[in-house]
């Protein structure tokens, strides 16, 4: 019969014949022949292959380097890679979490719009009129100015984006 030009799913073409691919978690030892099946072997410890494949070497699990602030979020298996994440208070510097940096703080005059997560940094926003932040913080939002009126007081010093208003007693006219 005519040799095949294309093979079924989970097969590959070699020496004019279709051989079975190795399943995830296993690597290729030898191609099939007319008389023998494809020979596959399980990946070793700290190795994986995540697809049906004809790879002769398994991939090494990723190393989550503690010197770069990384820790294991999910341990790898023979079919999946290790997933790294950052230690508390740090966030990844790329999608694949190459390394970690400290969450940044929002300077005075800025408040936290979104608190940092393991994969994204703190998002700061300038305090709008009527709000202030007098601290550098990774979690404090902008605070509203004190309402002097509700305390039966008057504004003695206007607030800024970094300072609260200063309230004082009302000047009462003597009779």
């Amino acid at each position: 019969p005519e040799p095949p030009t294309a093979c079924r799913e989970k097969q590959y073409l070699i020496n004019s014949q279709c051989c079975s691919l190795c399943q995830p978690g296993q690597k290729l030892v030898s191609d099939c022949t007319e008389f023998t099946e494809t020979e596959c072997l399980p990946c070793g410890e700290s190795e994986f292959l995540d697809t049906w494949n004809r790879e002769t070497h398994c991939h090494q699990h990723k190393y989550c380097d503690p010197n770069l602030g990384l820790r294991v979020q999910q341990k790898g298996t023979s079919e999946t890679d290790t997933i790294c994440t950052c230690e508390e208070g740090w966030h990844c510097t790329s999608e694949a979490c190459e390394s970690c940096v400290l969450h940044r703080s929002c300077s005075p005059g800025f408040g936290v719009k979104q608190i940092a997560t393991g994969v994204s940094d703190t998002i700061c926003e300038p305090c709008p009129v009527g709000f202030f932040s007098n601290v550098s913080s990774a979690f404090e939002k902008c605070h509203p100015w004190t309402s002097c009126e509700t305390k039966d007081l008057v504004v003695q010093q206007a607030g800024t984006n970094k300072t609260d208003v200063v309230c004082g007693p009302q000047d009462r006219l003597r009779a």
């Epitope: 991939h59 090494q60 790329s94 999608e95 694949a96 979490c97 390394s99 940096v101 994204s120 940094d121």
Partner: antibody, heavy 112, light 112 residues
Framework: VKESEGGLFKPTDTLTLTCTAS????????MSWVRQAPGNGLEWIGA???????YYASWAKSRSTITRNTNLNTLTLKMTSLTAADTATYFC?????????WGQGTLVTVSS | DIVLTQTASPVSGAVGGTVTINCQSS??????LSWYQQKPGQPPKLLIY???NLASGVPSRFKGSGSGTEFTLTISDLECADAATYYC??????????FGNGFGGGTEVVVK
Amino acid sequence: VKESEGGLFKPTDTLTLTCTASRFSLSSYDMSWVRQAPGNGLEWIGAIGGAGGTYYASWAKSRSTITRNTNLNTLTLKMTSLTAADTATYFCARGWTRLDLWGQGTLVTVSS
Amino acid sequence: DIVLTQTASPVSGAVGGTVTINCQSSEDISSNLSWYQQKPGQPPKLLIYAASNLASGVPSRFKGSGSGTEFTLTISDLECADAATYYCQGGYWSGISNFGNGFGGGTEVVVK
């Protein structure tokens, strides 16, 4: 990692380069494209993140597309509207700002 | 895009001596900076990552330091084989629409 052959292109042509990775899984790493014009420095084109997000330099954003095929373990760069200024050696590399594994690079020449 | 400004070329040093290359970033990139060595006709080679970490197989004569916007690569006990062009690369990533990446212009090191 190994890039596909570059070659000679005409202005306005579209460039498609493929990078094949072995011994590691593309889906676990950020992968970047970098180019270098003859006698010049390195220029970051863009990257695809481990989770599949795509990132481009502002000059490349409008005419570049980076994709990956995790089954074939390949990375592709497509760049449209080529000009002579795109003449360069194109590298694929593993990482984002820690490019620890580079291809040998492939020369792309754009000339009429 | 991030702009990285490197020490102007060339930088000269005698065998056994020390050279220093500076890299200044237009944005605060924390410690997210790498240094590469490139020789003619070859792809770049990672020397230092995360500002101060020595890449695998790189001799301890190479030392990286700095954080934020100012970074330095110091090569001590210079050898003839250190003659090359050195590049810094820096970036940050904080989600799909908040990122930056770029290379410095390169600094040629001449060993006398």
